[in-house]
């Protein structure tokens, strides 16, 4: 008799999830020799232990602590790039500017990037059919709690000047409900972080507006200032040229505004 299974509103666990996490872990240690001490089988066991046999609406940050401990990593605290709704460009940037790091450039972020996962209460099965949706089902689901946990830790580690890339094409350039707006902004440590510098990325070719004057950016500035952190903002009018100039800063066309 088939067992009744909870039907959630979100997509199910990514196919080949265990194999992908394990492979990504080994790949990460191959790419980053300083992380070769990591035992990837233990990392997978800790990842699995965070959500397997647990109700997927009842996951806590505590569930992920064994994984957090195994994935402990030191990144230069003054080289952190946060992003909101513009992941691809942020990753293209850190691929070129190798000394800067997004969360997905760390082991734990790399492991989970673009994946979905959940289990079921009282069974060791992974649910490949459906997983809870943050809005429609519950916020304390395995994926959301994971990203909240790693994002908080990443923001807490930041120091000096922290950069954030924001999508100027969206109606809310700064969105209080995004991971950046709801978690990272509130976990920057004022005693360590001097400035948050926002890079507002323009989408339109002929868009010459100063998006740093956008009401949502002013809202971000207000939140940051109240936390005793300075705020600065730059328009990136031509993201393609911006990346090109990061690659080749000596190019003569890179002295003008980008």
């Amino acid at each position: 008799v088939p067992r009744w299974r909870q039907q959630w509103s979100g997509p199910g666990t990514t196919k080949r999830f265990p194999e992908t996490v394990l492979a990504r872990c080994v790949k990460y240690t191959e790419i980053h020799p300083e992380m070769r001490h990591v035992d990837c089988q233990s990392v997978w066991d800790a990842f699995k232990g965070a959500f397997i046999s647990k109700h997927p609406c009842n996951i806590t940050e505590e569930d992920y602590q064994p994984l957090m401990k195994l994935g402990t990593q030191t990144v230069p605290c003054n080289k952190i790039l946060l992003w909101s709704r513009i992941k691809d460009l942020a990753h293209q940037f850190t691929q070129v500017q190798r000394d800067m790091f997004t969360l997905e450039d760390t082991l734990l972020g790399y492991l989970a990037d673009d994946l979905t996962w959940c289990g079921e209460f009282n069974t060791s099965k992974i649910n490949y059919q459906s997983c809870p949706d943050w809005r429609k089902d519950c916020s304390n689901n395995p994926v959301s709690v994971f990203w909240k946990t790693v994002s908080r830790r990443f923001a807490e580690a930041a120091c000096d000047v922290v950069h954030v890339m924001l999508n100027g094409s969206r109606s809310k350039i700064f969105d209080k409900n995004s991971t950046f707006g709801s978690v990272e902004v509130h976990n920057l440590q004022p005693e360590k972080v001097q400035t948050l510098e926002a890079w507002v990325i323009h989408g339109g070719r002929e868009d010459s507006r100063d998006l740093c004057q956008d009401p949502t950016i002013k809202e971000l500035e207000s939140i940051i200032s109240k936390r005793n952190i300075q705020f600065s903002c730059k328009n990136i009018y031509r993201p393609d040229k911006f990346l090109q100039c990061v690659k080749n800063p000596e190019d003569s066309s890179c002295t003008s505004e980008i």
């Epitope: 194999e19 492979a23 990504r24 080994v26 790949k27 191959e30 790419i31 020799p33 070769r36 691929q95």
Partner: antibody, heavy 120, light 107 residues
Framework: EVQLVQSGAEVKKPGATVKISCKVS????????MHWVQQAPGKGLEWMGW????????DYAEKFQGRVTITADTSTDTAYMELSSLRSEDTAVYYC?????????????WGQGTLVTVSS | DIQMTQSPSTLSASVGDRVTITCRAS??????LAWYQQKPGKAPKLLIY???SLADGVPSRFSGSGSGTEFTLTISSLQPDDFATYYC?????????FGQGTKLEIK
Amino acid sequence: EVQLVQSGAEVKKPGATVKISCKVSGYTFTDYIMHWVQQAPGKGLEWMGWIDPEYGRTDYAEKFQGRVTITADTSTDTAYMELSSLRSEDTAVYYCARSAHTTGFGFAYWGQGTLVTVSS
Amino acid sequence: DIQMTQSPSTLSASVGDRVTITCRASEDIYSNLAWYQQKPGKAPKLLIYDANSLADGVPSRFSGSGSGTEFTLTISSLQPDDFATYYCQQYNNYPYTFGQGTKLEIK
């Protein structure tokens, strides 16, 4: 069975660009880093760079930086190595290679090699 | 970059001999070292990884030892099939680097 099959020999003029392919089978392409290695005639082996096919991330040896581009097409399970501004010293056999995840980070699997001859 | 220095460059030996090839790293690479065998016109073949672990399908007459900066590859009793060029490689840090090779020839 893991296989890495490379494209055939090429003859190029100085200043030209060559693009070599490495088609894989027998494993999930995105699960492994792919490396490229150069071997000039009668010379030793020289590591050129790697790609993570899943994300397209790359890293290159300083010697080849600016002239080499490694790419991956996950729809065809194929890695590519492009070398530009060719000079006679680039005449060599080029290999794609990957580790086995169970053999440290030594290269357990190699393509058969592609000979590139640069000559005017 | 880490320099890998192999010695000797050429080694003449006979079937049944015990031979040793040495590889020295310019800095500590722990046990992050591999040994390869290469025959003319063929791709290198992995023999040893992590300095002393035998790769799958490699005969037990091959062995590796060492850690830090000094490493050796030993063939306990040379077989006709073993005459080839041998390379060490460090994978402790990028860029990965290879020794210049040791050509093992028939005496």
